[in-house]
Amino acid sequence: KESCDVQLYIKRQSEHSILAGDPFELECPVKYCANRPHVTWCKLNGTTCVKLEDRQTSWKEEKNISFFILHFEPVLPNDNGSYRCSANFQSNLIESHSTTLYVTDVKSASERPSKDEMASRPWLLYR
């Protein structure tokens, strides 16, 4: 479905399993037609999404899509949680689905869990 509305391509209930101490880039894929919208990231706290004002972000431009990137350098244990990007476009606020980061703290994990273990049992990840 082609349209000139801004669209944010984050899958509903998507998830990423990452290690504390590693760098990580969380991408918000943005499709727009003419003027690039103003995009922000926020972190869910219950039903409220708290805007991430002081975090490093950047844009990556590709042919048919752009990416608004939230940088984690490095990932910290309290980065665990759900994030959402939002775009302001012609006075409208467009919100993405949330995406969840499961952070494994390497100090307390005896070995790096496999991707399948992390994906299938995310409730075990932050321990």
């Epitope: 479905k1 669209q7 391509y9 984050i10 899958k11 509903r12 209930q13 998507s14 998830e15 990423h16 399993s17 869910l44 759900s82 919100e95 689905h97 949330s98 991707k115 399948d116 992390m118 994906a119 299938s120």
Partner: antibody, heavy 119, light 112 residues
Framework: QVQLVQSGAEVKKPGASVKVSCKAS????????MYWVRQAPGQGLEWIGR????????RYAQKFQGRATVTADTSTSTVYLELSSLRSEDTAVYYC????????????WGQGTTVTVSS | DIVMTQSPDSLAVSLGERATINCKSS???????????LNWLQQKPGQSPKRLIY???KLDSGVPDRFSGSGSGTDFTLTISSVQAEDVAVYYC?????????FGQGTKLEIK
């Protein structure tokens, strides 16, 4: 349009494993979630698990955890369900399905694969 | 796990009459985006299931407008305003919010 074609019927002995395939067309499977559901003869629908083909992350119903494995090959747009330690109660039609990961635009089911477990 | 309970288990309706199927979830189906991911499927005899309705009330493309969905919270309804012979099928509600995904037990629609 989006279509799914599943592999053919299988007959297996108890204790064996089965691997069913599901090939998608009309969509980039990285933009979807693909999932497996089964239906025992004369019964309702039972969700087995799903995969995000973009990163390989899986989720399973507790009942199938450790016995079912869902994998995806994005180069061939194919998703697989492997079920091990088969028992007679696993006799069912196994359906793969695909839905749009972003906007709920589509939800399409395969034609089903009959798996019969019998000694 | 979320329990999805449909009623009735079966119903027989005359051609042109209204059919109503209810679905109750054991807890809210609202996702983090505030939307309820409640779908209705139709499974005709010998066929694969097919999605009719998603997000409680949105019709899939190609689905006749005699089908409609409604509800909120934990109570949802599928209505066929004027039943046709080709509507003979089993109808399932299912929730796409919580893991594991779960289905209602199905409601068999027959023509009286």
């Amino acid at each position: 349009q989006v279509q799914l074609v599943q592999s053919g019927a299988e007959v297996k002995k108890p204790g064996a494993s089965v691997k069913v395939s599901c090939k998608a067309s009309g969509v980039n499977i990285k933009d979807t979630y693909m999932y497996w559901v089964r239906q025992a003869p004369g019964q309702g629908l039972e969700w087995i698990g799903r995969i995000d083909p973009a990163n390989g992350y899986t989720r399973y119903a507790q009942k199938f955890q450790g016995r079912a494995t869902v994998t995806a090959d994005t180069s061939t747009s194919t998703v697989y369900l492997e079920l091990s330690s088969l028992r007679s109660e696993d006799t069912a039609v196994y359906y793969c399905a695909v839905n749009d990961g972003y906007f709920e635009y589509f939800d399409v089911w395969g034609q089903g694969t009959t798996v019969t477990v019998s000694s | 796990d979320i329990v999805m309970t449909q009623s009735p288990d079966s119903l027989a309706v005359s051609l042109g009459e209204r059919a109503t199927i209810n679905c109750k979830s054991s807890q809210s189906l609202l996702d983090s985006d505030g939307k309820p991911y409640l779908n209705w499927l139709q499974q005709k005899p010998g066929q694969s299931p097919k999605r009719l309705i998603y997000l409680v009330s949105k019709l899939d493309s190609g689905v006749p407008d005699r089908f409609s969905g409604s509800g909120s919270g934990t109570d949802f309804t599928l209505t066929i305003s004027s039943v046709q012979a080709e509507d003979v099928a089993v109808y399932y509600c299912w929730q796409d919010t919580h893991f594991p995904r779960t289905f209602g037990q199905g409601t068999k629609l027959e023509i009286k």
